[in-house]
């Protein structure tokens, strides 16, 4: 027995039925992507990381989900202390607020 057609990657099992006239076949099949690959063509990659290149986990669709305190397309930009002046303060670590020269205070304001 052979099956021809598209089967999209899924965690679900699909039941295929075939009647050849001589015998009746019923079988279950599923196609899964390799580890860290996602999408219909398994052509999206996401592997959690927490280093210079980014700080993220992956959702069930392979989208990057930033760890707490991080943002940006690669989750490599720190979210500064709430209230930190966007003009006079900045941070490289989450919750931080480093002041520009000449500015001070908890929020560099």
């Amino acid at each position: 027995a052979s099956h021809s057609g598209m089967i999209n990657p899924s965690r679900q099992w699909q039941t295929l039925k075939q009647n050849t006239g001589v015998a009746h076949f019923e079988y279950q099949i599923r196609v899964t992507c390799d580890d860290y690959y996602y999408g219909f063509g398994c052509n999206k990659f996401c592997r959690p990381r927490d280093d210079f290149f980014g700080h993220y986990a992956c959702d069930q669709n392979g989208n990057k989900t930033c760890m707490e305190g991080w943002m940006g397309p690669e989750c490599n930009r720190a979210i500064c202390r709430q209230g930190c002046s966007p003009k006079h303060g900045s941070c490289k670590l989450p919750g931080d607020c480093r002041c520009q020269y000449g500015w001070q205070g908890l929020y560099c304001d």
Epitope: R47, D51, F53
Partner: antibody, heavy 116, light 107 residues
Framework: QVQLVQSGAEVKKPGASVKVSCKAS????????IHWVRQAPGQGLEWMGI????????KYAQKFQGRVTMTVDTSTSTAYMELSSLRSEDTAVYYC?????????WGQGTLVTVSS | DIQMTQSPSSLSASVGDRVTITCRTS??????LTWYQQKPGKAPKLLIY???ILDSGVPSRFSGSGSGTDFTLTISSLQPEDFATYYC?????????FGGGTKLEIK
């Protein structure tokens, strides 16, 4: 469309420094890191380092540590690579490239010739 | 540093041939591997990233496979424009080293 345009060819004497620029356009400059790669005549590709364009933090290959400086000017969306104490072995084409998952975009290359 | 061993260093083949280039890494890099094609006087061109994802616009005769330490680039049926030098590169950790290259020549 995404473009990386590099500065022109340079001829330098041994011991001198060279600064190559890479002007980006067609995307948000601070969203992607810039890498520098070089290729000596008839040789393979050699990764030199990466700069985080948002923070200006850089990481260099051990071989170039102490001799290379990578910087960015976010106001002009330009990355710079400066190599000091040049020697004849530094004669190469220097490329800037963009990316996190491999380099889909490259500059056209800058030939740096070191000769006395 | 992660070492990249690419083989063969050169290869002669004919139009229509199936060609395989391999890249071996000194440690597990999962799927953080990229393949490039470079023609003389030009910047490299991205073919495959994350070991097996074809970049947009790259013909389907190119394919990549492998994970961990062993990777393969396959060209299913060589075309005249495929004669070039091919490089692998890992992008797992710093430094992002390249393989030594494979020069693909016309037989």
């Amino acid at each position: 469309q995404v473009q990386l345009v590099q500065s022109g060819a340079e001829v330098k004497k041994p011991g001198a420094s060279v600064k190559v620029s890479c002007k980006a356009s067609g995307y948000t400059f601070t969203d992607y890191a810039i890498h520098w790669v070089r290729q000596a005549p008839g040789q393979g590709l050699e990764w030199m380092g990466i700069i985080n364009t948002y923070y200006g933090d850089s990481k260099y290959a051990q071989k170039f540590q102490g001799r290379v400086t990578m910087t960015v000017d976010t106001s002009t969306s330009t990355a710079y690579m400066e190599l000091s104490s040049l020697r004849s072995e530094d004669t190469a084409v220097y490329y800037c490239a963009r990316g996190y998952d491999g380099f889909a975009y490259w500059g056209q290359g800058t030939l740096v010739t070191v000769s006395s | 540093d992660i070492q990249m061993t690419q083989s063969p260093s050169s290869l002669s083949a004919s139009v229509g041939d199936r060609v395989t280039i391999t890249c071996r890494t000194s440690e597990n890099i999962y799927s953080y591997l990229t393949w490039y094609q470079q023609k003389p006087g030009k910047a490299p061109k991205l073919l495959i990233y994350h070991a097996k994802i074809l970049d947009s616009g790259v013909p389907s005769r190119f394919s990549g496979s492998g994970s961990g330490t062993d990777f393969t680039l396959t060209i299913s049926s060589l075309q005249p424009e495929d004669f070039a030098t091919y490089y692998c590169q890992h992008h797992y950790d710093i430094p992002w080293t390249f393989g030594g290259g494979t020069k693909l020549e016309i037989k």
